[in-house]
Interface confidence: low
């Protein structure tokens, strides 16, 4: 007799109700009375559920389990469990005898959610350039095990000075909190990405540390060390500032913004006036905040040619000027999946399919999964063209041997905006008969 | 595809100056730590500087004063200047992307010799 | 002499598995993700494994990395004869602010 399972383990999420498929070929003239159906426990034989004599025995497992009683003539000898615990991960046996007998296992996967991360700092005051911090990253009540990276602001792994542990509680969930050890740069901004390896959630959460900066003698020209992320269409900021000296007036002030490769000018400001935009019409100071030293730049409906390095040049008596980098990004749409072919699909038969994300900046990363979040690599051709605009529409193509049956994952990521698009579909092929038919 | 291609080595006298240039293509450059690494003939890998998307710099000590790290991101090339250059620099020297180099060229020979 | 050290060579047969070490300090190994690096003769160093135990896409399953305290360890399970090459581990170093190569382990099959 043979008794067919899901070969790739059943997931759950803890406190909700999981079906672990079981299923057989009824004869003709097949009747329950000649049923005898276990579940049970793989590894310890610990009693499950059963059905004998032609009755449902009931559950021996915490009274969490039922069996679809209208389906069991049919073959369908499936195990539902109610409110799912992590103590129910592992393997049950599902035995079937009527005349002859047949077994096989299926495998149960919990997993929960990990929360939003929430980050503190210490010290959180008074902090400058040069100064150790300790940044913690706390997430909840997830399950199994998370994989925790921390990065800096443009998504570059840091991966010195990270200790991490993981508790589980009472109810076998962990609470995980991983310490960041860093030395302050002028300013930067560090997140930590809780990932649970099972359902291939990210849970993300940053801190932006701005330190006071030392004074010094001459002007200092400041701006922030790491680039200005800006989404396409929206307006950006480009900070400059510098310390005026008591008694200065914005008639002593010049200041130019321009393009630091071309030299370009983008604005300025001389002979106490505002001389306006030489940039598309898209630049602005701020005229209010300019005496107390603030020589910020907005630059309006940010495109994709905006991006680059701006230079804010700014004269008193002294000179002084820095640059800031301009990151542009567009985030990419959910992602549509098409299938060829899509119909009458059996195991062992090749697939392709397809995934598509639009309109995104900059060029993508594409990685595919499985239904269990294993990556899959062969077999796999990503395209991407820029538009008249400038952003990239992703196309990847993933040819494939269909399984039994599976789930089939494309991921999108912007690498700047660190935001990951994702769209799968699962595939049911038509079971085998084995022997195969002629 | 992506790819990095070193250029700028060759044969310099001890105390003279070369300038190394790594051209990327096929990933979006500018988010990119890069680093140099090189390996002397017959020896194992020594890595010898790095720089950060956001241009912060560092260096290995044997390097520290002689040798710079740059990058220009319109162009999508990186820069290793070596001044005051000795014997013991004479080496292959790559190109990578991340300091712990997921992408490498195929190396520039450098031959300091009088 | 480098701060990570690496045993100069190792040898296996088909089949076998064979294990690098790679020995450092609280400061490398003992705080930071380790990367190895297999560079087969007369070509351009490739990465092996990163972050200590994960794989780059088209690097089977043979290989597979660990770290325990201040070592770490390459596996290469099911020798084969195109695994002769010289294997790097590398990390970063929190006290020297910079990078780290091991002096290499080269690797015959025999």
């Known amino acids: 007799l043979e008794v067919q399972v899901p070969e790739d383990p059943v997931v759950a999420l803890v406190g909700t109700d999981a079906t672990l498929c079981c299923s057989f070929s009824p004869e003709p003239g097949f009747s329950l009375a000649q049923l005898n159906l276990i579940w049970q426990l793989t590894d310890t034989k610990q009693l499950v559920h059963s059905f004998a004599e032609g009755q449902d025995q009931g559950s021996a497992y915490a009274n969490r389990t039922a069996l679809f009683p209208d389906l069991l003539a049919q073959g369908n000898a499936s195990l539902r469990l109610q409110r799912v615990r992590v103590a129910d991960e592992g393997s049950f046996t599902c035995f079937v005898s009527i005349r002859d007998f047949g077994s096989a296992a299926v495998s149960l996967q919990v997993a929960a959610p990990y929360s939003k991360p929430s980050m503190t700092l210490e010290p959180n005051k008074d902090l400058r350039p040069g100064d150790t911090v300790t940044i913690t990253c706390s997430s909840y009540q997830g399950y199994p095990e998370a994989e925790v990276f921390w990065q800096d602001g443009q998504g570059v792994p840091l991966t010195g000075n990270v200790t991490t542990s993981q508790m589980a509680n009472e109810q076998g969930l962990f609470d995980v909190h991983s310490i960041l050890r860093v030395v302050l740069g002028a300013n930067g901004t560090y997140s930590c990405l809780v990932r649970n390896p099972v359902l291939q959630q990210d849970a993300h959460s940053s801190v932006t540390i701005t330190p006071q900066r030392s004074p010094t003698g001459a002007v200092e020209v400041q701006v922030p060390e790491d680039p200005v992320v800006a989404l396409v269409g929206t307006d950006a900021t480009l900070r400059c500032s510098f310390s005026p000296e008591p008694g200065f007036s914005l008639a002593q002030l010049n200041l130019i913004w321009q393009l630091t490769d071309t030299k370009q000018l983008v604005h300025s400001f001389t002979e106490g006036r505002d001389q306006g935009s030489a940039y598309a019409n898209r630049t602005a100071l701020f005229p209010d905040l300019l005496a107390q030293g603030n020589a910020s730049l907005r630059l309006q409906r940010v495109r994709v040619a905006d991006e680059g390095s701006f230079t804010c040049f700014v004269s008193i008596r002294d000179f002084g000027s820095a640059a800031v980098s301009l990151q542009v990004a567009a985030p990419y749409s959910k992602p549509s999946m098409t299938l060829e072919p899509n119909k009458d699909l059996r195991p062992g038969d090749t697939v392709t399919i397809t995934c598509s994300s639009y309109r995104g900046y900059p060029e993508a990363e594409v990685f595919w999964q499985d239904g269990q979040g294993v990556p899959l690599t062969g077999n796999v051709t990503t395209s991407q063209m820029a538009n008249e605009q400038g952003l990239f529409d992703v196309h990847s193509v993933l040819r494939v041997v269909l399984g039994a049956n599976g789930t089939y994952s494309c991921l999108v990521r912007n690498p700047v905006l660190q935001q990951d698009a994702h769209g799968s579909v699962t595939i049911t092929g038509q079971p085998m008969t084995f022997p195969p038919e002629a | 595809e992506v790819q990095l291609l070193e250029s700028g080595g060759g044969l310099v006298q001890p105390g003279g100056s070369l300038r190394l240039s790594c051209a990327a293509s096929g990933f979006s450059f500018s988010n990119y730590d890069m680093s140099w690494v090189r390996q002397a003939p017959g020896k194992g890998l020594e890595w010898v500087a790095g720089?950060?998307?956001?241009?912060?710099?560092y260096y290995a000590d044997s390097v520290k004063g002689r040798f710079t790290i740059s990058r220009d991101n319109s162009k999508n090339t990186l820069y290793l200047q070596m001044n005051s250059l000795r014997a013991e620099d004479t080496a292959t020297y790559y190109c990578?992307?991340?300091?712990?180099?997921?992408?490498w060229g195929q190396g520039t020979t450098v031959t300091v010799s009088s | 002499q480098s701060v990570l050290t690496q045993p100069p060579s190792a040898s296996g047969t088909p089949g076998q598995r064979v294990t690098i070490s790679c020995s450092g300090s609280?400061?490398?190994?003992?705080?930071?993700?380790v990367h190895w690096y297999q560079q087969l003769p007369g070509t351009a160093p490739k990465l092996l494994i990163y972050?200590?135990?994960r794989r780059p896409s088209g690097v089977p399953d043979r290989f597979s990395g660990s770290k325990s305290g201040t070592s770490a360890s390459l596996a290469i399970s099911g020798l084969q004869s195109e695994d002769e090459a010289n294997y790097y581990c590398?990390?970063?170093?929190?006290?020297?602010?910079?990078?780290?190569f091991g002096g290499g382990t080269k690797l015959t099959v025999l």
């Open positions: 720089i950060r998307s956001g241009s912060r710099t």
């Open positions: 609280t400061f490398n190994i003992g705080t930071n993700l």
């Open positions: 590398a990390t970063w170093d929190d006290s020297l602010n910079s990078f780290l």
């Open positions: 990578g992307r991340y300091f712990n180099m997921d992408v």
């Open positions: 972050l200590t135990d």
